[in-house]
Amino acid sequence: SERCDDWGLDTMRQIQVFEDEPARIKCPLFEHFLKFNYSTAHSAGLTLIWYWTRQDRDLEEPINFRLPENRISKEKDVLWFRPTLLNDTGNYTCMLRNTTYCSKVAFPLEVVQKDSCFNSPMKLPVHKLYIEYGIQRITCPNVDGYFPSSVKPTITWYMGCYKIQNFNNVIPEGMNLSFLIALISNNGNYTCVVTYPENGRTFHLTRTLTVKVVGSPKNAVPPVIHSPNDHVVYEKEPGEELLIPCTVYFSFLMDSRNEVWWTIDGKKPDDITIDVTINESISHSRTEDETRTQILSIKKVTSEDLKRSYVCHARSAKGEVAKAAKVKQKVPAPRYTVELACGFGAT
């Protein structure tokens, strides 16, 4: 056959669906690879063809669209499973072609089993809620297009294994779940089960997401440098190791980039000739505030190094701060026999 633009296996779109539930999978060609949509392609006389490779097999085979009750079907650029089976797992390819044009992409589809408490190997999306921040909502994700607007599904929400009813600060409101005031105790996995009828059959859609309660913007402050500070003086003799920690606290800020860096005499350590190493460690609070520590180390400090200016800098979306370390050369203790004796006029 003629050459086909092959976009390969699109592992970025690792699609996971639950066993025994409906799944609608759009051909990724129109979403991520081509500059036109399915309607335009269809009007231009292009045909969309689907095929697949079963798990642990190399053989590409056509998808059987003649299964009982149309279990697998195609509608425009969507491949439908009503419902999925475990052995539908594999790599699926959609190919758009006519006599003069061809483009195709493959993507992995994994059919996943869940237990009665909705635990599964499914990768869960994370939704962040601000702590004590007034009413916030999460919405049952990825249920659009499964049923027409005329169908009124029933939606049941769970936290972990518990059906959400009479929770003191969490209220189910159809497709939404409202948190009147988010607390740390609201951290966890939330599942919505959407039940709807179709052609005399009942289908269930299960969607689980992780709620993570994070620091509120009300509590957010610019970076706080805990070390270096005015109480600690780094007093060293030449030849000793100089270790100065820069410890900075960052409030949680959505999508903020937290940065810590040292300057020595106003220059970045990479831009100067002295032998400096910097080691960084990061810890996070339960509400995703961050503490970064960068330890500046000079193995064998010289008297010149002890005269330099060592400044710790920190930056977040809330602002930029800097603090200089107090570094000085230790005055050697007097040697009694020579120096003190001289003071008494001894020669």
Epitope: I131, V170, N186, N219, S285, T291, T293
Partner: antibody, heavy 119, light 108 residues
Framework: QEQLVESGGGLVQPEGSLTLTCKAS?????????MCWVRQAPGKGLELIAC???????TWSASWAKGRFTISKTSSTTVTLQMTSLTAADTATYFC????????????WGQGTLVTVSS | DIVMTQTPASVEAAVGGTVTIKCQAS??????LAWYQQKPGQPPKLLIS???TLASGVPSRFKGSGSGTQFTLTISDLESADVATYYC??????????FGGGTEVVVK
Amino acid sequence: QEQLVESGGGLVQPEGSLTLTCKASGFDFSSNYYMCWVRQAPGKGLELIACIYTNSGNTWSASWAKGRFTISKTSSTTVTLQMTSLTAADTATYFCARDLNYPDTSNLWGQGTLVTVSS
Amino acid sequence: DIVMTQTPASVEAAVGGTVTIKCQASQSIGYYLAWYQQKPGQPPKLLISRASTLASGVPSRFKGSGSGTQFTLTISDLESADVATYYCQSYYNSDSDAFGGGTEVVVK
């Protein structure tokens, strides 16, 4: 009114075992509360033993408590602490406490139950 | 493991006076520090969270301050009802959950 009540304390022989129970009233464990056991030896300070997230079941234990002390959720309103190989050093009042992981919002303590390890 | 060091172990002050209790963390814990008051035969009672936020019903004579590794609880206009043992508690994350050793406050 939200309340925690500890029970199961008493006199136990050295090397013996004991299970303490913390019963919640006015709320249940469907929300992901962080329930902890804290002990206090006579005339001494507070010592955190172990904690459990009541919804997910994830647990945390102090390094010294691992192996001898086990925290569990046994119902939607009870948390237990199983203690084994007890010694005189384990003599203390054992408190059940809620949300020590973020006391800002819903910190709650029980009155405690006394455990005496003696022959 | 984190170590919370409280000083002094005991402090004596006159009614109407001021008491200062210090708590030092062995690693930075941001603002994640709580203070508790415990009277004999009772469980601890939360006074202050997030280093400086007063719990509901706690009089403004109690003041918390500090961040990082150094924290202070100040009790001003001391009353006889303030006779108790005071504990700090770190709650930055599960690696830093710990109580300080306690400070006994005695009225002269």
